[in-house]
């Protein structure tokens, strides 16, 4: 059965998935999809990485951790009730039927209180990034600017936003971790 994670409407949700690269920079392709893991790849893909980089990415879904070190945990920005459901993290370890599949269940709760109107931070503006999709389908490039310097205030704010949907250490214990090599 799927491990369950919770977040409130308007929060960022955090779905953990980790692997240990055999050597630094020796990355394994990973996909995230909405829906349980099918036979190959992920269904309704929201994000992919290849051996080098994130190569497919849809709005509101991003990797906040250091994916080059195997932290491929998914952050879903500003969740709504429609984001509830099962998500698949698939670590595509080369070889014969070597893929590791993790189904994670996200439960979105209504917000406890309606906050006073405040200026909502534009995450795309705060964290623009360059994304080039290559291979694996029709060529498509989206340039969203380069990654800026992130200051401690931003990191602290992010940490607060993520706290409710589980701490990283708890998540590592949930089983969505695989060691390679």
């Amino acid at each position: 059965s799927e491990v369950e994670y919770r977040a409130e409407v308007g929060q960022n949700a955090y779905l953990p998935c980790f692997y240990t690269p055999a050597a630094p920079g020796n990355l394994v392709p990973v996909c995230w999809g909405k829906g349980a893991c099918p036979v190959f790849e992920c269904g309704n893909v929201v994000l992919r990485t290849d051996e080098r980089d994130v190569n497919y990415w849809t709005s509101r879904y991003w990797l906040n951790g250091d994916f080059r070190k195997g932290d491929v945990s998914l952050t879903i920005e500003n969740v709504t009730l429609a984001d509830s459901g099962i998500y698949c993290c698939r670590i595509q370890i080369p070889g014969i039927m070597n893929d590791e599949k993790f189904n994670l269940k996200l439960v979105i709760k209504p917000a406890k209180v309606t906050p006073a109107p405040t200026r909502q931070r534009d995450f795309t503006a705060a964290f623009p990034r360059m994304l080039t999709t290559r291979g694996h389908g029709p060529a498509e490039t989206q340039t969203l600017g380069s990654l800026p310097d992130i200051n401690l205030t931003q990191i602290s704010t992010l940490a607060n936003e993520l706290r409710d949907s589980r701490l990283a250490n708890d998540l590592r214990d949930s089983g969505a971790t695989i060691r390679i090599g």
């Epitope: 999809g33 829906g35 349980a36 099918p38 036979v39 190959f40 790849e41 992920c42 269904g43 309704n44 893909v45 929201v46 497919y56 849809t58 595509q92 370890i93 080369p94 070889g95 014969i96 039927m97 070597n98 893929d99 999709t133 291979g135 694996h136 389908g137 029709p138 498509e140």
Partner: antibody, heavy 123, light 107 residues
Framework: EVKLVESEGGLVQPGSSMKLSCTAS????????MTWVRQVPEKGLEWVAS????????YYLDSLKSRFIISRDNAKNILYLQMSSLKSEDTATYYC????????????????WGQGTTLTVSS | DIQMTQSPASLSASVGETVTITCRAS??????LTWYQQKQGKSPQLLVY???TLAEGVPSRFSGSGSGTQFSLRINSLQPEDFGNYYC?????????FGAGTKLELK
């Protein structure tokens, strides 16, 4: 136009080996998962093996993985199925098929199929 | 392995009729189900994927439905070119498995 053309099959002896090939054209071969499916005459379809875009990940029907090897040559746009220790129950029409794909989908169903090649294993 | 049970095994119908073919999975496969049509001596053709999405170029008289373990393919107003064999395939569990097929014949 997407085309998948399998090599000639034929009659082979039990215990022997055979390598099938499937030449692809009309699409960017290296962007797609590829699959072999077989069909015994007048019977249903049976998945045999699949391979990912760059050939680093392969998937097999459990009962065949010790005897069959799927591979691909993206430079030549060719999919292969190397079969060894052939048995009479391997007699079938073998189809190569392309995994349906677009960004955001998974290649778990097959949108183009070859015409099929018939392999008969008999003494 | 996930078993796919198709029914009926064969079906006779006339042009203009509506027919329904069903497929049952031995366990929950969510919406990971595909339908193919295969005519005599030809390769299979993709009809419906993800239980209900019509493949490109497939006439709208075909429709798929269901999720979990129960699925169906409905063909409204049968046309002469619709006769042949129909197969369901699940793509949730390894190995990929197909139903045994339904033979749709002209009455």
């Amino acid at each position: 136009e997407v085309k998948l053309v399998e090599s000639e099959g034929g009659l082979v002896q039990p215990g022997s080996s055979m390598k099938l090939s499937c030449t692809a054209s009309g699409f960017t071969f290296s962007d797609y998962y590829m699959t072999w499916v077989r069909q015994v005459p007048e019977k249903g379809l049976e998945w045999v093996a699949s391979i990912n875009y760059d050939g680093r990940n392969t998937y097999y029907l459990d009962s065949l993985k010790s005897r069959f090897i799927i591979s691909r040559d993206n430079a030549k746009n060719i999919l292969y199925l190397q079969m060894s220790s052939l048995k009479s129950e391997d007699t079938a029409t073998y189809y190569c098929a392309r995994g349906y794909y677009y960004y955001g989908s998974s290649p778990n169903y097959f949108d183009y199929w070859g015409q099929g090649t018939t392999l008969t294993v008999s003494s | 392995d996930i078993q796919m049970t198709q029914s009926p095994a064969s079906l006779s119908a006339s042009v203009g009729e509506t027919v329904t073919i069903t497929c049952r999975a031995s366990e929950n496969i969510y919406s990971y189900l595909t339908w193919y049509q295969q005519k005599q001596g030809k390769s299979p053709q993709l009809l419906v994927y993800n239980a209900k999405t019509l493949a490109e170029g497939v006439p709208s008289r075909f429709s798929g439905s269901g999720s979990g373990t129960q699925f169906s393919l409905r063909i409204n107003s049968l046309q002469p070119e619709d006769f042949g064999n129909y197969y369901c395939q699940q793509h949730y569990g390894t190995p990929l498995t197909f139903g045994a097929g339904t033979k749709l014949e002209l009455k």
